[in-house]
Interface confidence: medium
């Protein structure tokens, strides 16, 4: 299974920071930048850094100490930009991350100084078996942007 | 345009059944968590559960399972199911999609 | 259950008066609040979240603030159509639980 999600302020749950995601493993998260067509809002483009952050870090909606993980960056709001997470218990690659069924793992992202975005937040639920279906579980909408 | 529309409401007798649906529109219910909340008559909001995109759900305990939220993703609709109702339950009864979007309501009356 | 003790329950203003409404939990819950408005026979409305932001499409009139315990939701200049029922809401914990509300009309 493929989850997307749109991460932008247009997503009324990620602004709340209550909006959860179950993955099984082997499933993939796919974070969706914004993305804008013309000048963009007369505010500025959203753009921010995402994390992988501690309970702490994420109630405060801060990405700082040795438990916060930068993932990616959505700096390109007017190219399409996406990013993809494999829920796996162990990963090959060096920047992967090790997923433990029955676990919660938080992300948020920081704007930019320069950006318009608020503090987005997401709790993702790992659950316990492996799946091998690809359909498409998408989570918030392109919203504005 | 993303529109909530509920139904299933109405009379009931105090041990009966009801299955209330709330039928959406402009968005999948795969998409977003959606929540129900109900209101009694001249009272406030309460909250009664909610089901998330991955199909979960979490419910306010003071219900004693007396309510079951669900869906049915072919027909983007979602359903609260009431049953052992009572005439506290008495509300109009709202679903809200990521507490941006919300259906009209529907008017359950629980009485004999 | 964390209970939301939402203050005043009711209050009398004119158009273009200052109004705070407050509320109180009764354990910390960071700044998972948020605030609702409903106007009669019509569903409510997000306004607030994570206490101090508000929605798009939302007035600057209305702010929010506070965070641990003590919320405040406050209008800067009253419009017309601003005098309705306020809630207050706390998702740091399930059950979601919601302030007893404050009608707000008109003097």
């Known amino acids: 299974l493929r989850h997307v999600v749109y991460w932008n302020s247009s997503n009324p749950r990620l602004l709340r920071g209550d909006a959860v995601v179950e993955l099984g493993l082997n499933d993939y998260l796919d974070i969706v930048c914004p993305h804008y067509e013309g000048p963009g809002p007369p505010e500025g483009p959203e753009t921010f850094a995402l994390y992988m952050v501690d309970w702490p870090g994420y109630e405060s909606c801060q990405a700082e100490g040795p438990r916060a993980y930068k993932r990616w960056v959505c700096s390109l709001p007017f190219g399409h930009v996406q990013f993809s997470e494999k829920i796996q218990r162990f990963t090959p690659f060096s920047l992967g991350f090790e997923f433990l069924p029955g676990e919660t793992y938080y992300y948020i992202s920081v704007p930019t100084p320069e950006s318009s975005g608020q503090c987005l937040r997401l709790q993702v639920s790992v659950c316990c078996k492996e799946r091998k279906s690809e359909s498409a579980h998408p989570v918030g909408s392109p919203g504005e942007s | 345009e993303v529109q909530l529309v509920e139904s299933g409401g109405g009379l009931v007798q105090p041990g009966g059944s009801l299955r209330l649906s709330c039928a959406a529109s402009g968005f999948t219910v795969t998409t977003y968590g959606v929540d129900w909340v109900r209101q009694a008559p001249g009272k406030g909001l309460e909250w009664l559960g909610v089901i998330w995109g991955g199909g979960s759900t979490n419910y306010n305990s003071a219900l004693k399972s007396r309510f079951t939220i669900s869906r049915d993703n072919s027909k983007n609709t979602l359903y609260l199911q009431m049953n052992s109702l009572r005439a506290e339950d008495t509300a109009v009864y709202y679903c809200?999609?990521?507490?941006?979007?919300w259906g009209q309501g529907t008017l359950v009356t629980v009485s004999s | 259950d964390i209970q939301m003790t939402q203050s005043p329950s009711s209050l009398s203003a004119s158009v273009g008066d200052r109004v705070t409404i407050t509320c109180r939990a009764s354990q910390n819950v960071g700044t998972n609040v948020a605030w609702f408005q409903q106007k009669p026979g019509k569903a409510p409305k997000s306004l607030i979240h994570s206490a101090s932001y508000r929605y798009s499409g939302v007035p600057s009139r209305f702010s929010g603030s506070g965070s641990g315990t003590d919320f405040t939701l406050t209008i800067s200049s009253l419009q017309p159509e601003d005098f309705a029922t306020y809630y207050c809401?706390?998702?740091?914990?399930?059950?979601?639980?919601f302030g007893g509300g404050t009608k707000l009309e008109i003097k």
């Open positions: 809200a999609s990521d507490w941006a979007y």
């Open positions: 809401q706390q998702y740091k914990r399930y059950p979601y639980t």
